[in-house]
Interface confidence: low
């Protein structure tokens, strides 16, 4: 499989772009809306009838260095006696970003794009019932 | 910036903080194909709170395409298959990073960009604050 | 508490257009979603518009491209501009939002509102 390239031929080279060497890319870490505001609805994880608890996982040697994960409570869902209805299914809702990782080799550092997986809360579906010949 | 634990035999000029600038090979390493969201899962049709998958491009950044969720319903789908308006279908949002061209139609320069998704849905009881 | 008015609904003929409007008024500290469902006699009440307080729309299949929803935030107002109208749109209009509001001093972050409904028919 191909790993994806970010540079795109069909993009007219400007000439104010800044001279980058071949095989790499110049990236400013510098977060562009980094101060704006998550406006969701308060604690849905544990309002949801597919409930979600969240960990956060700490890289030094990744940026962003914390990346949040939710975990689906149950296997079911949650139904009005609040109790766990089986018959449905929690499952999780996935979404990929991008990081960016440092790698050592020695005393010299380089640098790499990584997209991860980021599990971001949990809905409760209908289960896919196949049925054995 | 964040810390980094240095092999105590390298000089001293290595600076512990991720730089402001930093030069980035062009593959991006990853073990997750960009597919479609209505390929990779069906969860959107099949949730007691679906949504629709809407398409948002956009050539000065990558990835490129970004898939946007939207809650079908106000309610969420019962058992019978009906809407229950007792209950709220509510969109999942997280912010992610994406690389913006910067200077604009740069083919390899770029900054980081975060921005906020909704991922898809899910069905939630409305809440009450009691304000004293 | 929240209220949710409609206006707007009347007869029109097959082809022409109508414009609903639906204005939400009360203690509200926010507005999520606002939107129109329909319902047919001895059909159930289904999805017509929804816009987002991001600006994006949604709408059933069987009006695109016909129907366009607008909003007013500073008025909390929604409209449905209705052309091309059909027999098979004839249907009580209902406006509903999901709200953030306080009411009796308790603040209830997102629950979902409606409105008494609109008679639209449209004659052929």
């Known amino acids: 499989r191909k790993i994806p390239k970010v540079g795109h031929t069909f993009f007219q080279k400007p000439e104010s772009c800044p001279p980058v060497p071949g095989g790499s890319m110049k990236l400013d870490i510098g977060i562009i809306n980094e101060n704006q505001r998550v406006s969701m609805s308060r604690n849905i994880e544990s309002r949801s009838t597919s409930p979600w608890n969240y960990t956060v996982t700490w890289d030094p040697n990744r940026y962003p260095s914390e990346v949040v994960q939710a975990q689906c409570r149950n296997l079911g869902c949650i139904n009005a006696q609040g109790k766990e209805d089986i018959s449905m299914n929690s499952v999780p809702i996935q979404q990929e970003t991008l990081v960016v990782r440092r790698k050592h080799q020695g005393c010299s550092v380089s640098f790499q794009l990584e997209k991860v997986l980021v599990t971001v809360g949990c809905t409760c579906v209908t289960p896919v019932i196949h049925h054995v010949q | 910036g964040i810390t980094i634990p240095r092999n105590p035999g390298c000089p001293n000029s290595e600076d512990k903080n991720f730089p402001r600038t930093v030069m980035v090979n062009l593959n991006i390493h990853n073990r997750n194909t960009n597919t479609n969201p209505k390929r990779s899962s069906d969860y959107y049709n099949r949730s007691t709170s679906p949504w629709n998958l809407h398409r948002n491009e956009d050539p000065e950044r990558y990835p490129s395409v970004i898939w946007e969720a939207k809650c079908r319903h106000l309610g969420c789908i019962n058992a019978d298959g009906n809407v229950d308006y007792h209950m709220n279908s509510v969109p999942i949002q997280q912010e992610i990073l994406v690389l913006r061209r910067e200077p604009p139609h740069c083919p390899n320069s770029f900054r980081l960009e975060k921005i906020l998704v909704s991922v898809g849905c899910t069905c939630v009881t409305p809440i009450v604050h009691h304000v004293a | 508490e929240v209220q949710l008015v409609e206006s707007g609904g009347g007869l029109v003929q097959a082809g022409g257009s109508q414009r609903l409007s639906c204005t939400a008024s009360?203690?509200?500290?926010?507005?999520?979603?606002m939107g129109w469902y329909r319902q047919a006699p001895g059909k159930q009440r289904e999805l017509v518009a929804l816009?987002?307080?991001?600006?994006?729309?949604d709408y059933a299949d069987s009006v695109k491209g016909r129907f366009t929803i607008s909003r007013d935030n500073a008025k909390n107002t929604v409209y449905l501009e209705m052309n091309s109208l059909k027999a098979e749109d004839t249907a009580v209009y209902y406006c509903?939002?999901?709200?953030?509001?306080?009411?009796?001093?308790?603040?209830?972050?997102?629950?979902?509102?409606w409105g008494q409904g609109t008679q639209v028919t449209v004659s052929s």
């Open positions: 009360g203690t509200i500290v926010n507005i999520h979603v």
């Open positions: 816009i987002f307080s991001g600006g994006s729309a």
């Open positions: 509903a939002a999901e709200i953030g509001y306080y009411s009796g001093g308790t603040y209830y972050s997102s629950e979902a509102h």
